[in-house]
């Protein structure tokens, strides 16, 4: 009886794993083996595919074959018993084009209200992605184990920290890789779960802001308790994109080590031009907080995008606010070349209820105010340029009293 050729050959490539699967054409014939040959582009001869000779199952692995992953290859398969079937040729393919990104490796660290996720490619020193290793981005799905409500986070790098979580709570997540340059989306990792720790005695510092005063940067933050010491560290932002090493060498800002106030001042020349991450930690001598959320700090923008200066003309039921360019000794605000948008926050002095106005104009009316009432106003500038999505810090608050009831004109 003539043996039939195997059919429906599928080539699965995940990272550097090359797997072939096929269907037996005749289930009734026993003790059949299968063999593959391959042919490279521009070659006439066929070569035996090592790892896929005299296979008794309908699956084989040819990962050991050192192929140029960017070069097209062709495969053929036949069945063998006493005689052999005719060859069945598989459509030619380029391994790199066909390859899928495998599940990444994931390691988790827990804090009380945060989880640190370390992600690395599932195949170390992969041949398939050798030229693309630096281009991997990742996305993840995270959920509370108890609720199952999923949150998706896109475009993250090899280390990512998720904040604002609940203490003593189990969170689960899965991660997949993407190579956007090649339009490739990977396979999800297995689900990893971790429980956040008991709430720390000391919370991390919050609301970190950087401003410029003369030739110095002023770093301010909020903290719950008094009599604390703080330290501030910085890291080049680009290092977060470096997948190679899991050690981030955060550096101390010398003038911000063991400071006893919720601010520190350091010279602008501490930082060369660039984008940095800053973080702050609190200590009371016995206990240490976890690190604050990291803030991005761009020296180019920080030096120029200063909080707006404004004047207030008070009426009985409104304020007229006139916004001018910030005055800075020896520091021309270059950023004025960019269109700015102004965020104005105002509140009744005796209340915490803030209201917000966003305006492109430099003269703004704050309506619906009560007569003879003290209101406070602060403002900040935002760039409208998409590539340069930056904000200044808020100006200091200015408080004014509205006029008596008959002066609305």
């Amino acid at each position: 009886k003539n043996l039939k050729s195997p059919q429906k050959v599928e080539v699965d490539i995940i990272d550097d794993n090359f797997i072939l699967r096929w269907n037996r054409s005749d289930e009734s014939v026993g003790n059949v083996t299968f063999s593959f040959d391959y042919q490279k582009t521009g070659m006439d001869n066929w070569i035996k595919l090592s790892g896929c000779q005299n296979i008794t199952s309908t699956k084989c692995n040819f990962s050991s074959l050192k192929l140029n992953v960017y070069e097209e290859i062709k495969l053929r398969i036949r069945a063998e018993k006493e005689n052999t079937s005719s060859w069945y040729e598989v459509d030619s393919f380029t391994p790199f084009r066909k390859a899928q990104i495998g599940p990444p490796e994931v390691h988790l660290e827990a804090e009380d209200k945060a989880i640190v996720i370390h992600i690395s490619p599932g195949t170390k020193d992969s041949v398939m992605w050798a030229l693309d290793g630096l281009s991997f981005t990742y996305s993840l799905v995270i959920w509370k184990n108890s609720s199952g409500v999923e949150e998706r986070i896109e475009n993250i790098y090899s280390r990512h920290k998720i904040y604002k979580l609940s203490p003593e709570t189990t969170y689960c997540l899965k991660v997949k890789a993407a190579l956007l340059t090649s339009w490739k989306i990977g396979v999800y990792s297995p689900v990893h779960c971790i429980k956040t720790t008991v709430e720390n005695e000391l919370p991390p510092p919050e609301n970190i802001e950087v401003s410029v005063q003369n030739q110095n940067y002023v770093l301010k933050w909020d903290y719950t308790y008094a009599n604390m010491t703080f330290q501030v560290q910085w890291l080049h932002a680009f290092l977060k994109r470096n997948p190679g090493n899991h050690l981030y060498k955060w550096k101390q800002i010398p003038d911000c080590e063991n400071v006893k106030t919720t601010q520190c001042v350091f010279p602008q020349n501490v930082f060369q031009k660039g984008i940095y991450l800053l973080r702050v930690q609190a200590s009371d001598g016995n206990n240490t907080s976890f690190w604050s959320e990291e803030i991005k700090f761009d020296t180019e923008i920080q030096a120029f995008l200063l909080p707006p200066v404004f004047n207030i003309r008070s009426l009985s039921d409104s304020f007229h606010i006139y916004i001018g360019a910030p005055k800075q000794s020896g520091n021309t605000p270059v950023i004025q070349d960019y269109p700015l948008i102004y965020e104005i926050i105002f509140w009744e002095n005796t209340s915490n209820a803030e209201r917000k106005i966003i305006e492109k104009k430099t003269d703004v009316t704050v309506p619906n105010l009560k007569p003879l009432t003290v209101y406070c106003v602060k403002a900040r500038a935002h760039t409208m340029d998409e590539k340069l999505n930056k904000s200044s810090v808020f100006s200091d608050a200015v408080c004014e009293k509205t006029k008596p009831g008959n002066t609305s004109k």
Epitope: H107, L108, E109, A110, E111, D112, V116, H118, I194, T197, V198, N200, E201, G244, N245, H246, L247, Y248, K249, K251, Q252, N286, N287, T288, F290
Partner: antibody, heavy 118, light 107 residues
Framework: QVQLVQSGAEVKKPGASVKLSCKAS????????IHWVKQAPGQGLEWIGR????????KYAPKFQGRVTMTADTSISTAYMELSRLRSDDTVVYYC???????????WGQGTLVTVSS | DIQMTQSPSSLSTSVGDRVTITCKTS??????VAWYQQKPGKAPKPLIY???YRYSGVPSRFSGSGSGTDFTLTISSLQPEDFATYYC?????????FGPGTKVDIK
């Protein structure tokens, strides 16, 4: 493969100084921190400090501050620890270790025994 | 400084036994705890990092768990080569510290 090879045993007199070396191979020393740990005979492990070989930034345990100096020569992939004003209770084994972020101290040297005796 | 305590300080046990060593820290260190095994005259050998991850080449009978201030090293079925001293180590904040050690010897 990754290796940390430490210098040989030393015998010193009280009040003297000793400089130990830790030669790294199989990795770029600039990408990691090198830590030093001491262990007295029959006792536990005690952290002395660490150096970032890339820029020579150091952190020392308060107990050793002022008496220990860590340096590195990246051109020969070697970290050093100098301990001054030696006392008899400095008769211990000193280990260097590679620190790799959340991987902690993932490789250790074989240790150097320093004996302080008059 | 963060203080670390380990219990028990020593234990006598037999091959095949399940062994649990606990480590307490004086403050919350997240999951920044590692475990090392040391035999006489040898350098410490890394077993577990980040509380629960085994270093490559470490047998699966070794496992770590815990977070915050309470950590555990478990050896599911003790083998002859496991008789040694075990140290926990916090690398959350400077100065880094080690536990005093737990000596596991033959009953």
């Amino acid at each position: 493969q990754v290796q940390l090879v430490q210098s040989g045993a030393e015998v010193k007199k009280p009040g003297a100084s000793v400089k130990l070396s830790c030669k790294a191979s199989g990795f770029n020393i600039k990408d990691y921190y090198i830590h030093w740990v001491k262990q007295a005979p029959g006792q536990g492990l005690e952290w002395i400090g660490r150096i970032d070989p890339e820029d020579a930034e150091t952190k020392y345990a308060p107990k050793f501050q002022g008496r220990v100096t860590m340096t590195a020569d990246t051109s020969i992939s070697t970290a050093y620890m100098e301990l001054s004003r030696l006392r008899s209770d400095d008769t211990v084994v000193y280990y260097c270790g590679r620190y790799h972020g959340y991987w902690a101290l993932d490789y250790w040297g074989q240790g150097t025994l320093v004996t302080v005796s008059s | 400084d963060i203080q670390m305590t380990q219990s028990p300080s020593s234990l006598s046990t037999s091959v095949g036994d399940r062994v649990t060593i606990t480590c307490k820290t004086s403050q919350n260190v997240g999951t920044n705890v590692a475990w090392y095994q040391q035999k006489p005259g040898k350098a410490p050998k890394p077993l577990i990092y980040s509380t629960s991850y085994r270093y490559s080449g470490v047998p699966s009978r070794f496992s770590g768990s815990g977070s915050g201030t309470d950590f555990t090293l478990t050896i599911s079925s003790l083998q002859p080569e496991d008789f040694a001293t075990y140290y926990c180590h916090q690398y959350f904040s400077y100065p880094y510290t080690f536990g005093p050690g737990t000596k596991v010897d033959i009953k």
